[in-house]
Amino acid sequence: DPASKSRSCGEVRQIYGAKGFSLSDVPQAEISGEHLRICPQGYTCCTSEMEENLANRSHAELETALRDSSRVLQAMLATQLRSFDDHFQHLLNDSERTLQATFPGAFGELYTQNARAFRDLYSELRLYYRGANLHLEETLAEFWARLLERLFKQLHPQLLLPDDYLDCLGKQAEALRPFGEAPRELRLRATRAFVAARSFVQGLGVASDVVRKVAQVPLGPECSRAVMKLVYCAHCLGVPGARPCPDYCRNVLKGCLANQADLDAEWRNLLDSMVLITDKFWGTSGVESVIGSVHTWLAEAINALQDNRDTLTAKVIQGCGNPKVNPQGPGPEEKRRRGKLAPRERPPSGTLEKLVSEAKAQLRDVQDFWISLPGTLCSEKMALSTASDDRCWNGMARGRYLPEVMGDGLANQINNPEVEVDITKPDMTIRQQIMQLKIMTNRLRSAYNGNDVDFQDASDDGSGSGSGDGCLDDLCSRKVSRKSSSSRTPLTHALPGLSEQEGQKTS
């Protein structure tokens, strides 16, 4: 109708001005639209400059919406990580505090003279939990070797024990089992418990990091055009009241977020593996009962050594020869009473159960995050039409949207009518993050089986990192061993951890 050809652009002026743009750009009345590059070229209230400004704005608004959704998920994962991390660290710190409080009374100089060895063990356990690249079994073996050497000297102050004799003692140790069953039990249980705890917390870190990195992936130019058409072309074409058709919006965002949707399978695998590994938090080899009770195994070990002292000495002499006696030294150390300590099994505090049930629920809630993202953004951010199908904005006019809704992921966008997607060019950042998810899932599966995987990263660039910054100080390049000088590749998923305590030692 010829009269409508010179419709006023008042509504567009209002919306455009509200966006912070200069009103001098807006024509008073509709103009011919041959200059439009994105919107349909009918009569329009938008100049080229306005179209460009609104295209940039719509692009920025979608990126903001995407980042907001990601931030909510990141915050949830970060809160979970902090809660579990605090709990696990608390268990270990509690055990160390108990040891420091009870061992001097229970074992006297057998403890105080070796406080450094015990402190080092807890430091190593803490570092291992936080993602340091050390071998837990080796660390424990070296602790026992070191402790045996020192305690044997203490229990036999009358003997001259040169380094070569102590070397021999060390070689005999495995057969002699001087500490009874405690080292073996601790090794089996601690390996399972620490592997489970650290891989679970690392999983949370990796998940959070993937979300953060993916949120930074820029939307391409084809997406920008499609989003402009979706959000602002209705204004330019004089139907500002028309809201986007739901299926139209979904197709645009499925095209824009095609690469992100490809995270879905590995994301689900990761979250499933994390939920699964929480099974390992319970029972006698569970995280709570083991990490919180390290000191009780240590007490059992010292008691066993004292009980076995005479047999042990006889066997050592048999294997290593008769050591010289220090004429000025005293007789053998008096047998101390057995160190009495609280029973090994810690009653569960209930904290971990609560943390796990919350985590399971929240992880289940976000399992379909990546494939539900287009729908979520459309319904929450795009002010979709609730009107009947033929009253919504379909990208060309007010009316029905006929094309079918595309499937999820890059491959399914081959015929997306709204966004031209090159399915042969997947986004490399997202491919790397898929790889990070795979690696972490494999770690969790190994951890579920009680295995401490060799933390070698197969990532393309090693860019994935559990806490966002890679390793804490230089934890990851270290490989502790008094005997060997082998080293492993750095671990790229470290944990946020406590600052290392630097107290004055009391020996």
Epitope: Q113, R116, A117, R119, D120, S123, E124, L127, R146, E149, R150, K153, Q154, P157, L160, L161, P162, D163, L166, N326, G329, D473, R478, K479, V480, S481, R482, K483, S484, S485, E500, Q501, E502, Q504, K505, T506, S507
Partner: antibody, heavy 119, light 107 residues
């Protein structure tokens, strides 16, 4: 063979800080504690503290606790000792020394670094 | 703090002499004691650990004895290269402490 190579001599003004390095080779760096011992001209030996290169844990002599910081870099097998708020009585040769085994006894020593504090 | 007291602070000897240096701890340190030799401009060198065990590579004319609080370093027959300063050190508790040193001089 085990070698500890320290950084060169330093001249500092009172109130300044000095950071001495000690690069280790010939053994597993993370397997043995490293200590710092100083010796003022014509005087005896004074223990300053130790660092566990494996964990970074440190223990300092109370006398230096407020002024000394020991750190390590496992990638270069190097330990560092930083002493702040220097005064003239800190003029000394500073040695790094590696424990023999887990026994607080020093089997290997660096060549020493002379730090002179003078206005 | 465990204080280590060495005596004498210096001793003059001729080549071939027997020299004895003593070290006393302010409290019992069992056998946690080491002896070092230091020559001018050089770093100390370990001779004895665990009070009486000779370090590999140290000459057999050096010997250590003692337990608890009283310790002795003996050079059975002083050689020209033995003229140096000797320090004892306790390794039982922090802070680790050294004796004040004993200078063995040529008579």
């Amino acid at each position: 063979q085990v070698q500890l190579v320290q950084s060169g001599a330093e001249v500092k003004k009172p109130g300044a800080s000095v950071k001495v390095s000690c690069k280790a080779s010939g053994y597993t760096f993370t397997g043995y504690y490293m200590h710092w011992v100083r010796q003022a001209p014509g005087q005896g030996l004074e223990w300053m503290g130790e660092i566990n290169p494996s964990t970074g844990d440190t223990t300092y002599n109370q006398k230096f606790k407020a002024r000394v910081t020991m750190t390590r870099d496992t990638s270069t097998s190097t330990v560092y000792m930083e002493l702040s708020s220097l005064r003239s009585e800190d003029t000394a040769v500073y040695y790094c020394a590696r424990e023999k085994r887990d026994d607080g006894v020093f089997a290997y020593w660096g060549q020493g670094t002379l730090v002179t504090v003078s206005s | 703090v465990i204080w280590m007291t060495q005596s004498p602070s210096s001793v003059s000897a001729s080549v071939g002499d027997r020299v004895t240096i003593t070290c006393r701890a302010s409290q019992a340190i069992n056998g946690w004691l080491a002896w070092y030799q230091q020559k001018p401009g050089k770093a100390p060198r370990i001779l004895i650990y665990s009070a009486s065990t000779l370090q590999t590579g140290a000459p057999s004319r050096f010997s250590g004895s003692g337990f608890g609080t009283d310790f002795t370093l003996t050079i059975s027959s002083v050689q020209p290269e033995d003229f140096a300063t000797y320090y004892c050190q306790q390794a039982k508790s922090y802070p680790l402490t050294f004796g004040g040193g004993t200078k063995v001089e040529i008579k």
